[in-house]
C-alpha cells in the first residue's frame, strides 16, 4: 500500500521538492483535517504559508467567529486560512510572521516578527509576537502585548465599543488599535480618511486604506 505523503506547512512542501508557487493541501500531524493554502515558494527563500491575503475586495471579511476559525475565501486570491489551523501549527514549533503591504502609490513594505503564535480557541486565539524588524514601521502596528481575536459576533477587545462591528472584520483589536488588515477594502482615490479601512498605522498613518496585504508564516529554522 502506497504511503500518503502529507505536509503540515509550505516549508515542508518546499523541502519535498515542490518549489512552484500555488495552492497546496496541508494536514496537521495526527490529524485528518485538510486545508488548502497558498504557498509562496519565491519570496525570501520560499516556503511561506500564506495565512491572509487582500488584493481586490472580492471577498467579504466581515465574518463570524466560526468562519475565522475554519477559514474562508479563495487561496488563490483573497482569503483567511483559519485561526484553528494557524494556532495548532504555530504551537508545534517556532514560526516567524511576515506581513507584506502595498499602498496605492506603488510602494511596498513589510514587517517581520521573529516569533509568532496564536493561543488556543479557549484563549480567544490571542496573538503573541516578538522581535520586529522591517520597513513598515519601527513600532508594531499590531498592539503589544497581543490581544484576543474579535469578530462581529465575538467581542473580545478592550474598547467600550465593539471594534469588529465598528471597523469591520475580525482582528486582534485593542481599543481599537493601530491596525486592521481585515477591514473594508476601498479602491484608489477613495482610500483616505477611512475609519474602517485596511490599516497599518506605523507605515501609512491614520485613515489610509491599503491596496494589498499578505500575512505569511514559516518555521524559524527554515
Amino acid at each position: 500500500k502506497e504511503e500518503q505523503i502529507s505536509f503540515r506547512d509550505c516549508a515542508e512542501v518546499f523541502k519535498s521538492g515542490h518549489t512552484t508557487n500555488g495552492v497546496y493541501t496541508l494536514t496537521l500531524p495526527n490529524s485528518t483535517e485538510e486545508v488548502k493554502a497558498y504557498c509562496d515558494m519565491e519570496a525570501g527563500g520560499g516556503g511561506w504559508t500564506i495565512i491572509q491575503r487582500r488584493e481586490d475586495g472580492s471577498v467579504d471579511f466581515q465574518r463570524t467567529w466560526k468562519e475565522y476559525k475554519v477559514g474562508f475565501g479563495n487561496p488563490s486570491g483573497e482569503y483567511w486560512l483559519g485561526n484553528e489551523f494557524v494556532s495548532q501549527l504555530t504551537n508545534q514549533q517556532r514560526y516567524v510572521l511576515k506581513i507584506h503591504l502595498k499602498d496605492w502609490e506603488g510602494n511596498e513594505a513589510y514587517s517581520l516578527y521573529e516569533h509568532f503564535y496564536l493561543s488556543s480557541e479557549e484563549l480567544n486565539y490571542r496573538i503573541h509576537l516578538k522581535g520586529l524588524t522591517g520597513t513598515a514601521g519601527k513600532i508594531s502596528s499590531i498592539s503589544q502585548p497581543g490581544n484576543d481575536f474579535s469578530t462581529k459576533d465575538a467581542d473580545n477587545d478592550k474598547c467600550i465599543c465593539k471594534c469588529s462591528q465598528m471597523l469591520t472584520g475580525g482582528w486582534w483589536f485593542d481599543a481599537c488599535g493601530p491596525s486592521n488588515l481585515n477591514g473594508m477594502y476601498y479602491p484608489q482615490r477613495q482610500n483616505t480618511n477611512k475609519f474602517n479601512g485596511i490599516k497599518w498605522y506605523y507605515w501609512k498613518g491614520s485613515g489610509y486604506s491599503l491596496k494589498g496585504t499578505t500575512m505569511m508564516i514559516r518555521p524559524a529554522d527554515f
Epitope: 474598547c159 471594534c163 465598528m166 493601530p178 477611512k194 491614520s206
Partner: nanobody
Framework: EVQLVESGGGLVQAGGSLRLSCAAS????????IGWFRQAPGKEREGVSA????????YYADSVKGRFTISSDNDKNTVYLQMNSLKPEDTAVYYC??????????????????????WGQGTLVTVSS
Amino acid sequence: EVQLVESGGGLVQAGGSLRLSCAASGFTLDDYAIGWFRQAPGKEREGVSAIRDSDGSTYYADSVKGRFTISSDNDKNTVYLQMNSLKPEDTAVYYCAAVPAGRLRFGEQWYPLYEYDAWGQGTLVTVSS
C-alpha cells in the same frame, strides 16, 4: 465622504489671539470626537485639545491650559479653537482630526493619536516675538 477643513491660521504677534475653525462634513459631531493637533517643523505631531459632544468632555494639553478654549457648533458642524496669549512656541501647522466617540479603551477618557482616522490639511499659525 468624510472631510475636515481647517481655517483661521495666520501671522500674529506674541500675546495676540486667533480663532481656528474645523468644518466637518460626511458625519455629525454627535457621534465623533474632534481633536486639534499641531506640528512644528522637525517635531512630532502633538495633541492640543479635543472635544466630545456626546458627553460634553473637553481635553487640553498642559502647555495650552488657561490660554486655549475648544468649542463646537452642532448646527454648523464646526469645532473652534480659540487661542489667546499666544507664544512663539505655539508656532506650528494646526490640524483637526476625528475619531468615533465610542472608540475608547475601558477606563480611559481620550484617544491615542492612531485612533484619529480622518484629518484635515492643516492651517499654519505663526507667532512672532
